[in-house]
Interface confidence: low
């Protein structure tokens, strides 16, 4: 049904009125305002911005806007003892040192408080030793090194290129391989697009540019000292030795000028194949250690960063629903940045600001949404999704009972080629229907719908005539809502035509060069892509908060469950003999998926026919839709990952950014041929099939007629 049918909606106050109020010029103005100084989590500057946003959201017309503060573990370089990496000769003299900071971009030379590049939460240490080049430091890269090349990383300092997977996974892999330090660098192969100039003349990474970022392995825990509970005034904090997810070896990031100096001397083994070579003029030798002439030289890291409990501030705005005020649709994105945040996060925060302004304008004219809309400006996302997770921990009982949907709003752009959407299958139809109603901003698609340009540029690999929609992974603030609480979630942004580099980010990601000018000059001068993203995010929120029947289609879940069951069965069938030996059957899972499909189909039929004027029945049907995502939550969580509780989706154990389907079964099967106790390993596969089958069946039954 259209939003016009919602209670208290006059024809003027429909989706079109909301969308028409969104203006590209305002987004531009807000982006400029949010990016003039750094807004690092835990700093005075970011607190001031929180208060500014609180004040402006109140002016825009929200019913209430509050700050929610928490005292969480953050990490900063030591001001008087900078971090760097050296090459030392046999006498211990430093013959080369990496840069201490990025050369500031034009116009920003006199800006204070630019945090130098560092790996947040690195322990202190000054390890020295031989270097081993480990490609992207993925699981498969260490398999290649250790199993095929027989190279031992124990006691070595490893150097890994950024890209492909979350940096925290790289560090975890290096630790497990026995490394005593990690150097992360940006290779031009991954962060320098051919034919484009370096910033400030283009959007490519200059040689002195460096990607900052946290290197935690939190697995959804939030604040490392208070897992599961909010870091409030009376919190009990773990000792640092018991903190969740902290790395145990020093880690530091560098740019490709400095990387060249380290890699050009590498000796030892040649790279195993061309996939290990980047674009620098170096041999990409794996090591260990330097080549003949330089064999007595070592690498030394100097890391002096400190972990400190620091206050952070979320801004939480409320627009009360007129009919179902106890049902919450949440739009959230973070405010903290590594430096200026030109793309991450302020291109997203500016869009949220304009969405709030548009909703506020409608509210001032007497309109209210059917359901309550919560707007959030999260703090400390860059330090491990801390602000959103702490708030969700504090409000978990309300959220699990009242949370309808969460729409994420980090960076609005990572390119300007086409739309990119990751969401729960429940939202597929909502996204399809909405994008068919929006104009495409793309050149060559004038007068065409966003759906049309998106489908043309990013087609679904399975269904012709439909666009690709990806699984939710993690690495952003939807994590706690979706993976822990089971609240239907989605995200949308404009992206690049660069599928192979999906998880590497744009070239200037987390560098000092991520400025307002980067966006205004090179990515979106007319702010038309930002406006489109505002329409998609805002339109989703509008429909979720305002449609009489929730715009969720449970049949789409049935389709993907079958696809995921087929996929995991295929993986298992690579071991037919073991499946026979240990009596491994997927029958229960396929049976549960079949039941889900049938029940979902019947539910959808009832959804078309029921009496929508009966508020009790309407509420009952909507609750079944709202609680369907919740039904996929296992209260015990995944093995060794208690805060990843969604049985259908979890962040990949090998790459936090990527989503994995049936993650419990997938992880049980992963590298199973190398397990020392096959009987135990295949027993765990069987247990995970049981958990998945039970969960799918239980979820299906929530859609059955209630009595």
């Amino acid at each position: 049904k259209s939003s016009n049918e919602a209670t208290n909606i006059t024809p003027k106050h429909n989706m079109k009125a909301f969308l028409d109020e969104l203006k590209a010029e305002n987004i531009k103005k807000f982006l400029y305002n949010f990016t003039q100084i750094p807004h690092l989590a835990g700093t005075e500057q970011n607190f001031q911005l929180a208060k500014q946003i609180q004040s402006q959201w109140k002016e825009f017309g929200l019913d209430s806007v509050e700050l929610a503060h928490y005292d969480v573990l953050l990490s900063y370089p030591n001001k008087t003892h900078p971090n760097y990496i050296s090459i030392i000769n046999e006498d211990g003299n430093e013959i080369f040192n990496t840069s201490l900071f990025e050369p500031p971009p034009p116009g920003y030379e006199n800006v204070s408080d630019i945090v130098p590049p560092f790996s947040a939460f690195s322990p202190q240490g000054m390890p020295e030793g031989d270097l081993v080049y480990v490609n992207y430091a993925r699981t498969e890269d260490f398999f290649k090194l250790e199993r095929d090349m027989k190279i031992n990383c124990s006691g070595k300092i490893v150097i890994a290129r950024y890209g492909k997977v979350f940096r925290g996974n790289k560090v975890k892999n290096a630790q497990l391989a026995g490394a005593k330090g990690v150097i992360l660098y940006s290779d031009p192969a991954d962060y320098f697009a051919p034919g484009v100039k370096s910033y400030p003349d283009g959007w490519n990474l200059p040689g002195g540019g460096v990607q900052r970022g946290n290197i935690l392995n939190l697995n959804g825990a939030g604040d490392p000292l208070t897992p599961g509970y909010p870091a409030n005034e009376y919190a009990y904090r773990r000792g640092i030795a018991e903190a969740v997810g902290l790395p145990s070896i020093p880690v530091h990031p560098i740019g490709y000028y400095d990387a060249q100096k380290l890699l050009e001397k590498m000796g030892g083994s040649a790279p195993p194949d061309s996939s290990w070579r980047g674009s620098l003029k170096v041999p990409y030798n794996v090591g260990p250690g330097f080549t003949g002439n330089f064999s007595t030289q070592k690498v030394k890291m100097h890391i002096h960063s400190t972990n400190e409990v620091t206050r952070i501030y979320n801004v939480i705005g409320t627009l009360r629903g007129a009919v179902e005020p106890d049902r919450y649709v949440i739009l959230g994105g973070h405010r903290d940045s590594w430096v200026f945040g030109g793309i991450d996060p302020q291109s997203g925060a500016a869009v949220v600001h304009e969405i709030v302004r548009s909703f506020g304008t409608l509210k001032k004219e007497g309109w209210r949404p059917r359901r309550t809309i919560l707007f959030a400006s999260w703090d400390a996302e860059e330090f491990g999704l801390l602000g959103s997770t702490e708030w969700a921990e504090e409000n978990s009982r309300l959220l699990q009972e009242r949370g309808v949907a969460y729409i994420n709003a980090d960076s609005s752009i990572e390119g300007n080629y086409t739309l990119r959407v990751d969401c729960t299958p429940l939202m597929y139809s909502l996204v399809h229907n909405l994008t068919k109603e929006l104009k495409s901003p793309d050149e060559g698609f004038e007068g065409k719908s966003l759906y049309e340009s998106w489908t043309k540029k990013s087609p679904s690999p399975e269904f012709s005539g439909m666009p690709r929609i990806s699984k939710l992974g993690s690495g952003n603030d939807f994590e706690v809502f979706f993976q822990r609480l089971g609240i239907a979630s989605g995200r949308a942004r404009y992206t690049k035509n660069w599928e192979t580099n999906k998880f590497s980010g744009y070239p200037l990601y987390h560098s000092v060069y991520e400025t307002y000018e980067l966006v205004e000059k090179f990515y979106d001068p007319m702010f038309k892509y930002h406006l489109t993203v505002a329409q998609v995010r805002g339109g989703m929120v509008f429909e979720l908060a305002n449609s009489i029947v929730l715009p969720f289609d449970c049949r789409d879940y049935a389709v993907v469950l079958r696809k995921y069951a087929d996929k995991i069965y295929s993986i298992s069938m690579k071991h037919p003999q073991e499946m026979k030996t240990y009596s491994v059957s997927f029958d229960s899972l396929f049976s549960a998926v079949k039941n889900f499909t049938e029940i979902a189909s019947k539910f959808s039929e009832r959804l078309q026919d029921f009496d929508k004027s009966n508020p009790i029945v309407l509420r009952m049907m909507n609750d079944q839709l709202m609680f369907l995502e919740r039904a996929f939550i296992d209260p015990l969580g995944l093995p060794d990952r208690p805060f990843y509780r969604h049985v259908i989706y979890a962040p990949s154990s090998h790459n936090k950014y990527a989503g994995e389907s049936f993650p419990g079964i997938y992880d049980a099967l992963f590298d199973i041929e190398s397990k020392v106790d096959p009987s135990k390993a295949w027993g765990e596969v069987k247990r995970q099939i049981y958990v998945a089958a039970f969960t799918v069946q239980a979820a299906a039954e929530t859609l059955s007629e209630v009595a």
């Epitope: 700093t43 500057q45 900063y76 001001k79 008087t80 201490l100 006199n110 945090v115």
Partner: nanobody, 124 residues
Framework: EVQLVESGGGSVQPGGSLRLSCAAS????????MTWVRQVPGKGLEWVAN????????YYVDSVKGRFTISRDNAKNSLYLQMNSLRAEDTAVYYC?????????????????GGQGTTVTVSS
Amino acid sequence: EVQLVESGGGSVQPGGSLRLSCAASGFTFSDYWMTWVRQVPGKGLEWVANIKQDGSEKYYVDSVKGRFTISRDNAKNSLYLQMNSLRAEDTAVYYCARDRGGAVALYHNGMDMGGQGTTVTVSS
């Protein structure tokens, strides 16, 4: 306006000594940490040493420890770097810089580098 003028550079043989000076004006010198950085042509800036407002804390990059000494005279608005046992790898343009404290004192901030620098060449 912040002004920083470096002097005292020159050519010297390995093992020799030089004393660099920096005359500061345009700001309250005694309110700021001060820093020496250096740049080898074609390479990035390298932090060398820094000194607290009252001179009570000094920090050095490992490669110069025991050879270089940073000092200051707040009465004269001057910063110094005594460089002993010079090596070829110390060859660089040396700049003095005002460490911009800002609101957060937890990390190494950007620095105001107003001067043209003074060149130190160490070769036999």
